[in-house]
């Protein structure tokens, strides 16, 4: 199976350098990795082509670095795609303004079919305006200005695969660049099930690993490996066989790891927060 990892360094964009790094551990170079803008998730983002370069620190990796460019050029949804033997694996992620009026509770949220779900956005700026919520760019919900809570929520009592997508929140007087984004991933199967008919029982994935609905395999969080994610990697390492290393001075600080669906994005062990720097 492919080992593809997308590192979203600082998904909340300010005036600091920000990057995307897509790593394919041990792949041969004639199976190229691509990084692009995910217009399916967010149509109205910047259309300038990305300057994708080889990551010199790794054998098979591509990188996009924004050095203090205008945030409007960065704000949006992205993907990294790898192909092997005709099969494509795509990892999705997002970058948004640190100065957004709301911030998501998490960058991605993975739930099982039928789950009772609350998608949450934290109010950062207080304004005398209605709050509005969109899904994949289409309006779904508004909250009158005097009723906007500190935590703005979208409630889905029985999540279905069609509920999956990019949810965004902003004040009604705002725009794309003052919006907060979070991506809801809904597994095709109910909890602990996998297979075309969802009638196979998942292996119990440990350490917050996620059962893949098509293969029944555990997708392990960064920093864990093994069939059930039972083995902890050495400090500051990640990847299916723990061969990749975080090169930062503080290890995996500010590394938001995004893995193929249905996993989504998370921090390495020991880090938390939207930026994985807490």
């Amino acid at each position: 199976a492919m080992d593809l990892i997308l590192i979203n360094s600082l998904p909340l964009v300010s005036d600091a350098e920000t990057s995307l790094t897509c790593i394919a551990s041990g792949w041969r170079p004639h199976e190229p990795i691509t990084i692009g803008r995910d217009f399916e998730a967010l149509m109205n983002q910047h259309q300038d082509p990305l300057e994708v370069t080889q990551d010199v620190t790794r054998e098979w990796a591509k990188k996009v670095v924004w050095k203090r460019e205008k945030a409007s050029k960065i704000n949006g949804a992205y993907f990294c795609e790898g192909r092997v033997r005709g099969e494509a694996i795509r990892i999705r992620t997002m970058k948004m303004r640190q100065q957004a009026s709301f911030l998501p509770a998490t960058l991605t949220m993975t739930v099982d079919k039928g789950d009772n779900v609350n998608i949450s956005f934290k109010k950062v700026l207080i304004k005398e305006e209605d709050a509005v919520i969109y899904k994949n760019g289409s309006f779904i919900h508004s909250v009158p200005r005097h009723e906007v809570p500190d935590i703005l929520e979208v409630h889905l009592p029985h999540a279905q695969p069609q509920d999956a997508g990019v949810y965004s929140a902003r004040y009604i007087g705002g725009n794309l660049f003052t919006s907060a984004f979070t991506r809801l991933i809904v597994r095709r199967c109910e909890a602990q099930k996998w297979g075309p008919e969802c009638n196979h029982l998942c292996t119990a994935c440990m350490n917050n690993g996620v059962c893949h609905e098509d293969t029944g395999e555990c997708i392990c969080p960064p920093g864990f490996m093994g069939r059930t994610c039972e083995k902890a990697c050495e400090l500051h390492t990640f990847g299916r066989t723990c061969k990749e290393r975080c090169s930062g001075q503080e290890g995996c600080k500010s590394y938001v790891f995004c893995l193929p669906d249905p996993y989504g994005c998370s921090c390495a062990t020991g880090w938390k927060g939207l930026q994985c720097n807490e």
Epitope: Q47, K70, F139, I172, G173, N175, L176
Partner: antibody, heavy 122, light 112 residues
């Protein structure tokens, strides 16, 4: 200070051309759609043209379609209106206006320039 | 094109009066979500217009609470609850549902 400053207005003969500029400052210019609105002497407001934040969407009033061209240079924080085949009825104060949106949808113009007068007369 | 008709075309009021201006559109401005695609602007002689209300009833930043927008579909109202000396100006409604964006002909509010 957030401001828009128009320039390029003046007296021009019918059939002539003029290029208006609008210099933006105090806000992130390429986060927003921009518009031109005009007002003939003693008359009401008339929307002329609009352009989205990344120039991906451009729209015109029927009265200027084919004669006027709206454009923007985000690297210079400047909006333009190229006006060709000018007519007497194009005589007006031309305002540039900032939208609150990045796209040409749910528009509202929260910042306006002081206006530049275009007079078309022989 | 959507036609916008304001009434009255002018009115006289005293400081402290409640002033109501109406705007009617030739087709509904109510979008699929509950917002109406209508803005209100104030313009003083020799000055640029100023945004007061957007999406029917949302007050723009810094606009005093005495200004309010209401209505839905094709009939809209701008209300100044207690008119102040600085409010004497011309007011315009504008529809933003479809291009071309169109303004009403204006309502001039004068001192009685």
């Amino acid at each position: 200070e957030v401001q828009l400053v128009e320039s390029g207005g003046g007296l021009v003969q019918p059939g002539g051309s003029l290029r208006l500029s609008c210099a933006a400052s105090g806000f992130t210019f390429d986060d927003y759609a921009m518009h031109w609105v005009r007002q003939a002497p003693g008359k009401g407001l008339e929307w002329v043209a609009g352009i989205s934040w990344n120039s991906g969407s451009i729209v015109y009033a029927d009265s200027v379609k084919g004669r006027f061209t709206i454009s923007r240079d985000n690297s210079k924080n400047t909006l333009y209106l190229q006006m060709n085949s000018l007519r007497a009825e194009d005589t007006a104060v031309y305002y540039c206006a900032k939208d609150i949106r990045e796209q040409l949808v749910e528009d509202a113009f929260d910042i306006w320039g002081q206006g530049t007068l275009v007079t078309v007369s022989s | 094109d959507i036609q916008m008709t304001q009434s009255p075309s002018s009115l006289s009021a005293s400081v402290g009066d409640r002033v109501t201006i109406t705007c009617r559109s030739s087709q509904s401005l109510l979008h699929s979500h509950r917002y109406n695609y209508l803005d209100w602007y104030q313009q003083k002689p020799g000055k640029a217009p100023k945004l007061l209300i957007y999406l029917g009833s949302n007050r723009a930043s810094g606009v005093p609470s005495r200004f309010s927008g209401s209505g839905s579909g094709t009939d809209f109202t701008l209300t100044i609850s207690s008119v102040q000396p600085e409010d004497f100006a011309t007011y315009y409604c504008m529809q933003t549902l479809q291009t071309p964006l169109t303004f009403g002909q204006g309502t001039k509010v004068e001192i009685k």
